[in-house]
Structures are given as structure tokens and as C-alpha cells.
Interface confidence: low
């Protein structure tokens, strides 16, 4: 048993059928010595008396808010949550496996630049009685600070018969060094509590591996005289690290016909302009990627040829 | 322009060669995300590599003040990786395919290090750790880890030279 936060405790249970569970001793936070009784949740049934209560925690029916009273007055509370381990593996029932980039990916994170700011998100089908708290650090043995905000519900989607809820959190490395080569990964830890079930999820990454620039901005076409060619120009996204002479991007320019089956013409360039042939009903799209490190491409920025 | 403590490198040449190094490092190990190497207990193998750290002056401001600190650190790293790529880790079994980019990568590391340190000019180099994996699969894993680490190193080096070519060239 360990303390998650004040008056909230997590009991770790090997979840085998009829496992005897864990013996837990609760102590009433009071100078009083006698006349103390204990109840669980909203029930008025007295579970025991005295300053301490010894319980055998086996299953969710044994978890909950234990309260000690004296003469009708509440003295203190202890909330017991369960963390289940089945077949030697901690349960992962609360979050959905996103399966990208590999199985057992519960947390996904992205950064728009090298400033040390990143966003993580996760999915669940649970709509109520759900809380998350997020902690992060750079490295684990001698951790350096990363500050995370509160996790918020960022999207709701319908998937077949189920509703899926996306939660996200923003974190910022306290003393980020954008130009340095990372040697210690960022660690992100999410505590999830659903009703009386506790679970924790972790992710470990380098900022350089989760970089995904925003799409290029101000995408414009300039027709070239007496030609089907156009000059496409764009700018670095505002959110990208500066100076651009140091934090450089490379770009992919694509000409795509109306039909998905039509051949796509692609040009790669380090410049912020390119000359392409604009076909009728086609569109021109540009996306960006770090020039020197192959992390994710941005989403496409697009304009119609007409 | 001249920089305190040494002459200015051929920024444009260094830029071109470092960008080529980036391309080669990724073609030698494109499996980004397919193998999470941090799960494979790599502490004893790749945390001895020289990293370009915050105090090494490789940021835009540090380069403007005195690029020599940063260039020395990059040179150390290039020599270190050049030795690793020429070691038993890459030459031993399982042998690399004949058209593997590792050979080119090795030569380019040497080329860039020579651009940074002409004959008769000596910077301290870092000792290469004695890594002698006994099993072919361990060697394979070590190669992946070294290449992943090299990708991060040459990305920073390429940024330095790109910025230098754009702002510090005579």
C-alpha cells in the first residue's frame, strides 16, 4: 500500500481468483483514543471500533472511502483504490491501446518545435468517474523538471457503437536547451483513476523523435507567363523554432488531381518555393519536416490550382 | 571570419558534408520507431558517446560568441563515431551488405573531421569505449543503437554548419 495523495491510498493486488488479498491497517487521524467507529462509503454499518481498523482487501467491494467517527462527528477519511496485477502484469483497462507506432501504446506525444513544449494524449471509452494526473521529468535517476498542466477532455468521437474520449495534456521542460543533442529521454507518467481502480501509464521519448511541425503557412501560387507552370511559395510555420538558418525544414510539394487514382507529382526542396505544373482541377499541397532529423512530416497545407 | 582561438572552418563545405552525413545516417538505419532501443538496456553501451550538450556553445548565440568550443566538440564526436564505425562492431559478423551506406558514412565522418582539423592542428579526442559484443545479435543491436545515436549527433552538427554557412561565413 502506498499514498497517492493526502488521504488516498493505492493497494496493489495480485488479482487471482480468490487471492487472499492484502491486509491493510487504517489509522484514524485524531488524538482521540476511544469511542471511535469505522464505516465504508455511504453505509452506516459499523465495520469496527478503535483507533485502528484492520481489513483484508481482496476486491473492489473492499475498496472505497473509509471514515472514522466519534459520536456522530467525522474524524478523518482514507480512500482506498485498487491497482490490479493479473498474470504478473499491471492492468491497463482504463485507456485504449492506440497501437501506433506499436502495440501497447497508450500515450502518444508530439512537439511542434524544439522549445521543450510537448502535448500528450490518450483515449478511453469511459465517460464518468474518471480522473487523471500527469507528471513528467527529463531522465529518471536524477530527474530534471518538466511542468505539466491538467489533463483535459480534448475530443469526443463515435467509433461504431462506442463513444471514444480523447484527453490531452501540455507539458514544458523547465530549462529546455533547444540546440543541444538530447541524451536523456523525457519520461511521462499518467495516473488514471476510474471509480476505485488505479492504473498508471508511462511513455519515454526524446523530443527530437516526437517532432511534428505545423503545416507551412501562406501557401501561394504565382502563374508564370506563357506557361502551365506556377511558382508555389510558402513560409515556415510560426510555431517552428528559430532562427530558421539553424532550425531548418525541408519540404515536399505535391500536385494531386481530383481523383485519388491520378498520379501524384512530388518535389522535395529545402527552399520555400518551387515551380510545378498546375493541372486543371488539381490542388497543390506542401508539408514540412525537420531537414536534418527524420521525425514526422507535418500535415499538408493545400491550395487549388484554379 | 576568424574566430578567437582558431581559424574559421570552411562553413559551406562543412554544411554540405554534414547534410550528406544526415542522409547517410538515416539510410543506414531507417527503422525509426520499429525497435525501441531504449527498452533494450543500452545504458552501458551508448551513454559513453560524446553528446553535444547545453554548455558546448553549439546554439546560435554560442556560435556567434566563439564557435571553437562547439567545433571542438563536434570534431570529438566525429572521430569517436568514425572509430566505432570502423570497429569490430560494424566489420564483424553478421557482415554488412556490399551496398550498405555504412562504408560511405564512415568515409564521410572522416572527411568532415579532416575539414574541421587540418594537418598539424590537434584537438583532444575522446577515448572510444571497448565494446566487444560476443554474439552476432548483440552486435546487430549495438549497430542500431550507435546509428540512432549518430543520427541525433549529426543533426545537431548539420544545424551548426548550416547556421554558420548562413551567418558566419567570411
Amino acid at each position: 500500500i502506498w499514498e497517492l495523495k493526502k488521504d488516498v491510498y493505492v493497494v496493489e493486488l495480485d488479482w487471482y481468483p480468490d487471492a487472499p488479498g492484502e491486509m491493510v491497517v487504517l489509522t484514524c487521524d485524531t488524538p482521540e483514543e476511544d469511542g471511535i467507529t469505522w464505516t465504508l462509503d455511504q453505509s452506516s454499518e459499523v465495520l469496527g471500533s478503535g483507533k485502528t481498523l484492520t481489513i483484508q482487501v481482496k476486491e473492489f467491494g473492499d475498496a472505497g472511502q473509509y471514515t472514522c467517527h466519534k459520536g456522530g462527528e467525522v474524524l478523518s477519511h482514507s480512500l482506498l483504490l485498487l491497482h490490479k496485477k493479473e498474470d504478473g502484469i499491471w492492468s491497463t483497462d482504463i485507456l485504449k491501446d492506440q497501437k501506433e507506432p506499436k502495440n501497447k501504446t497508450f500515450l502518444r506525444c508530439e512537439a511542434k518545435n524544439y522549445s521543450g513544449r510537448f502535448t500528450c494524449w490518450w483515449l478511453t471509452t469511459i465517460s464518468t468517474d474518471l480522473t487523471f494526473s500527469v507528471k513528467s521529468s527529463r531522465g529518471s535517476s536524477d530527474p530534471q523538471g518538466v511542468t505539466c498542466g491538467a489533463a483535459t477532455l480534448s475530443a469526443e468521437r463515435v467509433r461504431g457503437d462506442n463513444k471514444e474520449y480523447e484527453y490531452s495534456v501540455e507539458c514544458q521542460e523547465d530549462s529546455a536547451c533547444p540546440a543541444a543533442e538530447e541524451s536523456l529521454p523525457i519520461e511521462v507518467m499518467v495516473d488514471a483513476v476510474h471509480k476505485l481502480k488505479y492504473e498508471n501509464y508511462t511513455s519515454s521519448f526524446f523530443i527530437r523523435d516526437i517532432i511534428k511541425p505545423d503545416p507551412p503557412k501562406n501557401l501561394q501560387l504565382k502563374p508564370l507567363k506563357n506557361s502551365r507552370q506556377v511558382e508555389v511559395s510558402w513560409e515556415y510555420p510560426d510555431t517552428w523554432s528559430t532562427p530558421h538558418s539553424y532550425f531548418s525544414l525541408t519540404f515536399c510539394v505535391q500536385v494531386q488531381g481530383k481523383s485519388k487514382r491520378e498520379k501524384k507529382d512530388r518535389v522535395f526542396t529545402d527552399k520555400t518555393s518551387a515551380t510545378v505544373i498546375c493541372r486543371k482541377n488539381a490542388s497543390i499541397s506542401v508539408r514540412a519536416q525537420d531537414r536534418y532529423y527524420s521525425s514526422s512530416w507535418s500535415e499538408w497545407a493545400s491550395v487549388p490550382c484554379s | 571570419r576568424a574566430v578567437p582561438g582558431g581559424s574559421s572552418p570552411a562553413w559551406t563545405q562543412c554544411q554540405q558534408l554534414s547534410q550528406k552525413l544526415c542522409t547517410l545516417a538515416w539510410s543506414a538505419h531507417p527503422l525509426v520507431g520499429h525497435m525501441d532501443l531504449r527498452e533494450e538496456g543500452d545504458e552501458e553501451t551508448t551513454n559513453d558517446v560524446p553528446h553535444i550538450q547545453c554548455g558546448d556553445g553549439c546554439d546560435p548565440q554560442g556560435l556567434r560568441d566563439n564557435s571553437q568550443f562547439c567545433l571542438q566538440r563536434i570534431h570529438q564526436g566525429l572521430i569517436f563515431y568514425e572509430k566505432l564505425l570502423g570497429s569490430d562492431i560494424f566489420t564483424g559478423e553478421p557482415s554488412l551488405l556490399p551496398d550498405s551506406p555504412v562504408g560511405q558514412l564512415h568515409a564521410s565522418l572522416l572527411g568532415l573531421s579532416q575539414l574541421l582539423q587540418p594537418e598539424g592542428h590537434h584537438w583532444e579526442t575522446q577515448q572510444i569505449p571497448s565494446l566487444s559484443p560476443s554474439q552476432p545479435w548483440q552486435r546487430l543491436l549495438l549497430r542500431f543503437k550507435i546509428l540512432r545515436s549518430l543520427q541525433a549527433f549529426v543533426a545537431v552538427a548539420a544545424r551548426v554548419f548550416a547556421h554558420g554557412a548562413a551567418t558566419l561565413s567570411p
Epitope: 495480485d14 481468483p17 480468490d18 487471492a19 476486491e59 467491494g61 504478473g88 483497462d93 | -
Partner: antibody, heavy 114, light 112 residues
Framework: EFQLVQSGAEVKKPGASVKVSCKAS????????MNWVRQAPGQRLEWMGV????????TYNQKFKGRVTITVDTSASTAYMELSSLRSEDTAVYYC???????WGQGTLVTVSS | DIVMTQTPLSLPVTPGEPASISCRSS???????????LNWFLQKPGQSPQLLIY???TRASGVPDRFSGSGSGTDLTLKISRVEAEDVGVYYC?????????FGSGTKLEIK
């Protein structure tokens, strides 16, 4: 008082499917996994699979290779076991048993016969 | 899968006499938490199985103290100190150390 009440006996033709229900009462249905066990005439008990009613997650005995599906309707506190592609050797009494195997349903006889 | 081998197949006993049923597991049921994940059941004629012993030696609620369980990780025993007429039926051991859970073939206890 804890109780598991199963649906009545079924007679099925080979190749058909059967769906047996198990209604729970006297406890919080979502707190406990539900197991399904069967017993062919004169044979040992055979565990088929288990479901976590809170999340719908299942673990099956690979012997039944995709033929068994365990589901729950939490609003009705009921677990279901469906067995498809029935053959004569599936003739058995099918039991639901709450986590810990301390509480069992009364059993449902499924007869597979042409 | 873990194979549970039960002996004897049939056990005729005189009321008041002790009885012992053995169960051997193909793999240790002693888990790293120090617990042995074995259940014993009694199935009386025409009834569902009832849990007698869990975790090798803990009696389920309402089970008389004449029933006891013991053993190592692989060799397990159910003992009845003094058999009574109501104890007739088929006794099964079951491992719940890993999926799929498996049962022994059963021991039929009869009154002589």
C-alpha cells in the same frame, strides 16, 4: 444473497450456435469477473473463458479457437456465453461461475443432436 | 496448458474414517507471492460444483473443518479427517495459476 441464475436447457443441431445467459444478483455485477465452465457427460470440468464485466475484456481457452464469445449486459447484470459451429461433443452442462469460483450458476444443459 | 492428474479415480470410505485425495500438477502452482493457486471442489450428484478449499489450504466459508488442504507447488492433497455420509460426490482439483484454468479428472468418493 449472491445468486447466479442461468437460462434453460437447449437442443441444437450440429453447425448451429447456442447462447446461454447467466443473471447475477446480490452483488455489484461489474466488481467480479465471470467465468464459464462446461462439463460433458462423465467428463472432467473444462474452463472456457472469463470476462471482466466492467471493461468487457475477455480471455478464452484456446481449445475453443474462436468458437466461443463471452459478453455482458451490465444494465441487466447478465453474462452471456455463445458457442458456434456446434458438434455432438459440445453436448454438456454449461456453468457460469463468479470470480473465485465460490458461486456457480445451476447449469444449462445443451444437447447437440441431428 | 497445465495438466492436473488426480488419484485415485474412485475412493470407497467407511463413515468416520479419514480419506485423502491427491492431485499432481505438471507445473508448479506456487507463485512468486508465496501463494499456491489451487482450488478443491466437491460436486454432489445433480448439483453444481461447490468450492471447498482455495489457495491450496484456505477453507471457503461454511466448509467444515474436517476438510483440509496441503502440499507443495506440484503435489497437492485434500484430506477429510472423518468422512460423513453427506461428503459423497466427485472431488475436483483446479489450478488457477495461469490461463487456461484446468481441472483434475475427478475422484469419486463413495460410502462403503
Amino acid at each position: 444473497e449472491f445468486q447466479l441464475v442461468q437460462s434453460g436447457a437447449e437442443v441444437k443441431k450440429p453447425g448451429a450456435s447456442v447462447k446461454v445467459s447467466c443473471k447475477a444478483s446480490g452483488y455489484t455485477f461489474t466488481d467480479h469477473n465471470m467465468n464459464w465452465v462446461r462439463q460433458a457427460p462423465g467428463q472432467r470440468l473444462e474452463w472456457m473463458g472469463v470476462i471482466n464485466p466492467n471493461y468487457g475484456t475477455t480471455t478464452y481457452n484456446q481449445k475453443f479457437k474462436g468458437r466461443v464469445t463471452i459478453t455482458v449486459d451490465t444494465s441487466a447484470s447478465t453474462a452471456y456465453m455463445e458457442l458456434s459451429s456446434l458438434r455432438s461433443e459440445d453436448t454438456a452442462v454449461y456453468y457460469c461461475a463468479r470470480r473465485g469460483f465460490a458461486y456457480w450458476g445451476q447449469g444449462t444443459l445443451v444437447t447437440v443432436s441431428s | 496448458d497445465i495438466v492436473m492428474t488426480q488419484t485415485p479415480l474412485s475412493l470407497p470410505v467407511t463413515p468416520g474414517e479419514p480419506a485423502s485425495i491427491s492431485c499432481r500438477s505438471s507445473k508448479s502452482l506456487l507463485y512468486k507471492d508465496g501463494k499456491t493457486y489451487l482450488n478443491w471442489f466437491l460436486q454432489k450428484p445433480g448439483q453444481s460444483p461447490q468450492l471447498l478449499i482455495y489457495l491450496m489450504q484456505t477453507r471457503a466459508s461454511g466448509v467444515p473443518d474436517r476438510f483440509s488442504g496441503s502440499g507443495s507447488g506440484t503435489d497437492l492433497t485434500l484430506k477429510i479427517s472423518r468422512v460423513e455420509a453427506e461428503d459423497v460426490g466427485v472431488y475436483y482439483c483446479q489450478q488457477i495459476a495461469e490461463y487456461p484454468f484446468t481441472f483434475g479428472s475427478g475422484t469419486k468418493l463413495e460410502i462403503k
